[in-house]
């Protein structure tokens, strides 16, 4: 973010700059923060969409935002805003959030290509020994839940664990 | 393509009173803040006044301040700055100016020349 | 009010030379500056932004760097059409402050 703060467009607030803080910052609009996934152009005296400066040059602010467009934008893999990182579907098939779910289904109708211990839960040989060995961590608890790719196998808390969000 | 057109410079006496006119197109007007910048004959760059993509935020030199007002009308894709008790250091060429901070989008106007003198 | 001090105020240099000039901040402004070349009688046109960020159409010769309070613009190798006057601009708190120019004239 600039030092001059960030401007919630479309805010009526009218600055006055006789007021200002000690650092020199003005008050008012300037101080305010923008929507999310915008970040305030202090050139432009307005906030600006992340999408706009991706290409170009990464503002602090929309640096996750950022990251994760282009995340998306790789085929077989989504963004983790907890984690802040870009994780690949193919890690973490079984136990996956729902971004990965058309690449992970479409996995899963090839055993060939799945991890021992896949094929052992598709062909009913679900071990319910939940030891932390998930492909894919905690991070937010959950209780169990049934896995998007394979309908009727649960998974607990540890392997479940995940940022639902796109 | 971006263009921006100064105009209303010319020669005034001091404690008077100008009005400059900035003319954009090629660009959506309404959504984008718009500077004035100045330079006064031989010397350096000097920023003006900022104003918001609607008129709403208006930001100042301490050096105008109190005497320069900087508005815009969107309907006709027109910035201002009016300038009243004009002195002799504000004798300059007057740049209207629009620009991004983060996105290669940067554009100047021509200028208008302002004499204050008696 | 955030002071831009640039140096220095002028230099002489040769076709193919390199040239360096620096601009610093009175307090700390991240990355938030640009680099500014104005030729006489013509509008200013903005060669770097974001402190490193080549604007589009810019020669690659030109560059930038620096964080924080100290900044500098780097000619690689001085063109003909490079001597003009270059100023640093300051966008991290208003109001927006200008260093005092760059004049880059013929040895």
């Known amino acids: 973010m600039s030092g001059l703060g960030r401007s919630r467009r479309g805010g009526r607030s009218r600055v006055d700059q006789e007021e200002r803080f000690p650092q020199g910052l003005w008050t008012g609009v300037a101080m305010r923060s923008c929507p999310e996934e915008q970040y305030w152009d202090p050139l432009l005296g307005t906030c600006m969409s992340c999408k706009t400066i991706c290409n170009h040059q990464s503002q602090r602010t929309c640096a996750a935002f950022c990251r994760s467009l282009s995340c998306r934008k790789e085929q077989g893999k989504f963004y983790d805003h907890l984690l802040r990182d870009c994780i690949s579907c193919a890690s973490i098939c079984g136990q996956h959030p729902k971004q990965c779910a058309y690449f992970c289904e479409n996995k899963l109708r090839s055993p060939v290509n799945l991890p021992p211990e896949l094929r052992r839960q598709r062909s009913g040989e679900v071990e319910n020994n939940s030891d932390n060995s998930g492909r894919y961590q905690g991070l937010e608890h959950r209780g169990s839940e049934a896995s998007p790719a394979l309908p009727g196998l649960k998974l607990s808390a540890d392997q479940v664990a995940l940022v639902y969000s796109t | 393509q971006v263009q921006l057109v100064e105009s209303g410079g010319g020669v005034v006496q001091p404690g008077r009173s100008l009005r400059l006119s900035c003319a954009a197109s090629?660009?959506?007007?309404?959504?984008?803040?718009l500077h004035w910048v100045r330079q006064a004959p031989g010397k350096g760059l000097e920023w003006v006044a900022l104003i918001s993509y609607d008129g709403s935020n208006k930001y100042y030199a301490d050096s105008v301040k109190g005497r320069f007002t900087i508005s815009r009308d969107n309907s006709k894709n027109t910035l201002y700055l009016q300038m009243n008790s004009l002195r002799a250091e504000d004798t300059a060429v007057y740049y209207c100016?629009?620009?991004?901070?983060?996105?290669?989008?940067?554009?100047w106007g021509q200028g208008t020349l302002v004499t204050v003198s008696s | 009010d955030i002071q831009m001090t640039q140096s220095p105020s002028s230099l002489s240099a040769s076709v193919g030379d390199r040239v360096t000039i620096t601009c610093r901040a009175s307090?700390?402004?991240?990355?938030?500056l640009g680099w500014y070349q104005q030729k006489p009688g013509k509008a200013p046109k903005r060669l770097i932004y974001a402190a490193s960020s080549l604007q589009s159409g810019v020669p690659s010769r030109f560059s930038g760097s620096g964080s924080g309070t100290e900044f500098t613009l780097t000619i690689s190798s001085l063109q003909p059409e490079d001597f003009a006057t270059y100023y640093c601009?300051?966008?991290?708190?208003?109001?927006?402050?200008f260093g005092g120019g760059t004049k880059v004239e013929i040895k």
């Open positions: 601009l300051q966008y991290y708190s208003y109001p927006l402050t």
């Open positions: 100016w629009y620009s991004s901070s983060w996105t290669p989008l940067d554009y």
């Open positions: 307090q700390g402004i991240r990355n938030d």
């Open positions: 090629g660009f959506t007007f309404s959504s984008y803040g």
